[in-house]
């Protein structure tokens, strides 16, 4: 399906709004420190010349690839070389090695000042003033912070965004009624990018049969009354969906999930009972509706596993025959009757289960070596079972925050070289896998918490990949996808490590502490917690809550003292000589 | 302070059972989680069972699965591992270990207290 001008095709496809929108997405994805101005320029460029295209497909530059054509428009910035160094150097490529240089330079941490939200009153004036340009700083803001967020997601997000506003601003009580609507934005987006974020690296770090394993397992979760033919169809088409955006290919990969999104409401009766709701909303709310919905009810005949894919003399035939294939039903089968399973638990299975038939197919006698293999899964389904259970146990009994803080002396005794910015952040978010999932009954608890686990330890992987301190990160984040949970569950103390020296200014705390906000004291506090325990890798918890504790009296009692200050530095030293001896 | 000492090693033939004992002094002992871990002669030392502090909880390793059963009784203080059809790859020096959150974790650094250890030697 070749078109003369391939930005006249996406412009038309998509109209101009969202490709004004996602062009913004994919600008501010690559050159994340560029100023807002200068990148709605550069759209309003790309735009102009579009329209351009679109009115002569036959005009000069419109043959170009959109790669050739964005790329050309990025490398026209003058500061390129020094804001971004040695990114400037990937304008001197040809395509297609341009673009692979753009998308190695994108930067997961950017040094970027975190958004503050100013007060509703100028939000509302700020929206009535100018609607376009104040969604489009919305995108922008969002893009450059998330260079793999999901763009027509994106586009989403800001219609949600727009909504919220036009709403609450005409509200009695604007703030009543906005703020929960932007937390609740800001949520669901920086979950929605750590989710995208372990698709990308799925696909880029693992290649599309890793990606693709994922969709077959998750797909058949959610359409079990769907043929395995209709499931592949799916996956291949959401395959290429996802190549695209995480490539940055974002009008192609837009255009796409729009065509995916048709041809499911379509084909709903071959596809889920579920859909119907869905394909009554407009187009963005309906791929995303799509994307989230609730696994169908699984078909109530289905036969044992054990005919097909053990007790046939067949197995190792069917195997030979065509990998893959009898891999993926066999992915699928396992699938569609486990929705209690997490897709990595799924993709474990699928895994030692190709690893026996590797093994057996060679045998002298393959149907008596294989006749146990579901025996073999027995362990593998236990451990994410007991993992669960066990950490549902200390979260009900610990509450968020306790439950984050011994999140956060585990992963720091495990690997105590990872910055400690980085060991807040992850544990905290580890922890909010209890109030995620713990809730929930007992047949939705272990993909729910497994699955986000992974999300999470993706953003450690990558986090770890741009400044690499630890060989057993490393090691856990590159050598499988699907077992890098339990990868990680399995470290033990690391006896190597060397403990930090004691810093007194690292313990040491102001009257500033009282103003913050609960979460910026949790956080003040976890970050303590952290060097402590790299200062002290073999203190117990037993010790490590004590000190907690009296840390939590001692910054309560200065915050309440009428010279705060002073209080922090009379009793300060002490708290800190008494923590000490007690960790001695 | 929690004071752990095991008893009950020693030499069995391979098929044998042996039954080790975990006493506990110190702060109250239904509070903790007990975990038994071994050290087989020159390799690091692993995971065996667990059993959360109202024992109702129990975990093993894949290895002693079936073979081996955890047990406590708080009353007393003591913490028990029945170990049963025994195998020359079972020889270890076997640790009690206690852990205060409760839970009966399979890392070994979860535990605050540990005792000294019985040799348990399978062998004909």
């Known amino acids: 399906d070749t078109h003369k001008s391939e930005v006249a095709h996406r412009f038309k496809d998509l109209g101009e709004e969202h490709f004004k929108g996602l062009v913004l997405v994919a600008f501010s994805q690559y050159l994340q420190q560029c100023p807002f101005e200068e990148h709605v320029k550069l759209v309003n460029e790309v735009t102009e010349f579009a329209k351009t295209c679109v009115a002569d497909e036959s005009a000069e530059n419109c043959d170009k690839s959109l790669h050739t054509l964005f790329g050309d428009k990025l490398c026209t910035v003058a500061t390129l070389r020094e804001t971004y160094g040695e990114m400037a150097d990937c304008c001197a490529k040809q395509e297609p090695e341009r673009n692979e240089c753009f998308l190695q330079h994108k930067d997961d941490n950017p040094n970027l000042p975190p958004l503050v939200r100013p007060e509703v009153d100028v939000m509302c004036t700020a929206f009535h003033d100018n609607e376009a340009t104040f969604l489009k700083k919305y995108l922008y803001e969002v893009a450059r912070r998330h260079p793999y967020f999901y763009a027509p997601e994106l586009l989403f997000f800001a219609a949600r965004y727009k909504a919220a506003f036009a709403e609450c601003c005409q509200a009695a009580d604007k703030a009543a009624c906005l703020l929960p609507k932007l937390d609740e934005l800001r949520d669901e987006g920086k979950a929605s990018s750590a989710k995208q974020r372990l698709k990308c690296a799925s696909l880029q770090k693992f290649g599309d049969r890793a990606f693709k394993a994922w969709a077959v397992a998750r797909l058949s979760q959610k359409f079990p009354k769907a043929e395995f033919a209709e499931v592949s169809k799916l996956v291949t088409d959401l395959t290429k969906v996802h190549t695209e955006c995480c490539h940055g290919d974002l009008l192609e990969c837009a255009d796409d999930r729009a065509d995916l999104a048709k041809y499911m409401c379509e084909n709903q009766d071959s596809i889920s009972s579920k859909l119907k709701e869905c394909c009554d909303k407009p187009l963005l709310e309906k791929s995303h509706c799509l994307a989230e919905v609730e696994n169908d009810e699984m078909p109530a005949d289905l036969p044992s596993l054990a005919a097909d894919y053990v007790e046939s003399k067949d197995v190792c035939k069917n195997y030979a025959e065509a990998k893959d294939v009898f891999l993926g039903m066999f992915l699928y089968e396992y699938a569609r009757r486990h929705p209690d399973y997490s897709v990595m638990l799924l993709l474990r299975l699928a895994k030692a289960y190709e690893a026996t038939l590797e093994k057996c197919c060679a045998a002298a006698d393959p149907h008596e070596c294989y006749a146990k293999v579901f025996d073999e899964f027995q362990p593998l389904v236990e451990e994410p079972q007991n993992l669960v259970k066990q950490n549902c146990e200390l979260f009900e009994q610990l509450g968020e925050y306790k439950f984050q803080n011994a999140l956060l002396v585990r992963y720091t005794k495990k690997v105590p070289q990872v910055s400690t910015p980085t060991l807040v952040e992850v544990s905290r978010n580890l922890g909010k896998v209890g109030a995620k999932c713990c809730k929930l009954p007992e047949a939705k608890r272990m993909p729910c918490a497994e699955d986000y686990l992974s999300v999470v330890l993706n953003r450690l992987c990558v986090l770890h990949e741009k400044t690499p301190v630890s060989e057993k990160v490393t090691k856990c984040c590159t050598e499988s996808l699907v077992n890098r949970r339990p990868c990680f569950s399995a470290l033990e103390l690391d006896e190597a490590y060397v403990p930090k020296a004691f810093n007194a200014e690292t313990f040491t705390f102001h009257a500033d502490m009282c103003t913050l906000s609960e979460k910026e004291k949790q956080v003040k506090k976890q970050t303590a917690l952290v060097e402590l325990v790299k200062h002290k890798p073999k203190a117990t918890k037993e010790q490590l809550k004590g000190v907690m504790d009296n840390f939590a009296a001692f910054v309560e009692k200065c915050c309440k003292a009428d010279d705060k200050e002073a209080c922090f530095a009379e009793e300060g030293p002490k708290f800190v000589a008494a923590s000490q001896a007690a960790l001695a | 302070q929690v004071q752990l000492v095991e008893s009950g090693g020693g030499l069995v033939q391979p098929g044998g059972s042996l039954r080790l004992s975990c006493a506990a002094s110190?702060?109250?002992?239904?509070?903790?989680?007990m975990g038994w871990f071994r050290q087989p002669p020159g390799k690091e030392r692993e995971f065996v069972a667990s059993?959360?502090?109202?024992?109702?909880?129990?975990y093993y390793a894949d290895s002693v699965k079936g073979r081996f059963t955890i047990s406590r009784d708080n009353a007393k203080n003591t913490g028990y591992l029945q170990m049963s059809s025994l195998k020359p790859e079972d020889t270890a020096v076997y640790y009690c270990?206690?852990?205060?959150?409760?839970?009966?974790?399979?890392?070994?650094?979860?535990?605050?207290?540990w005792g000294r250890g019985t040799q348990v030697t399978v062998s004909s």
């Open positions: 270990a206690a852990d205060s959150d409760g839970i009966g974790w399979f890392n070994s650094f979860e535990y605050d207290y």
């Open positions: 110190g702060p109250i002992f239904s509070t903790y989680a």
């Open positions: 059993i959360n502090r109202s024992g109702d909880s129990t």
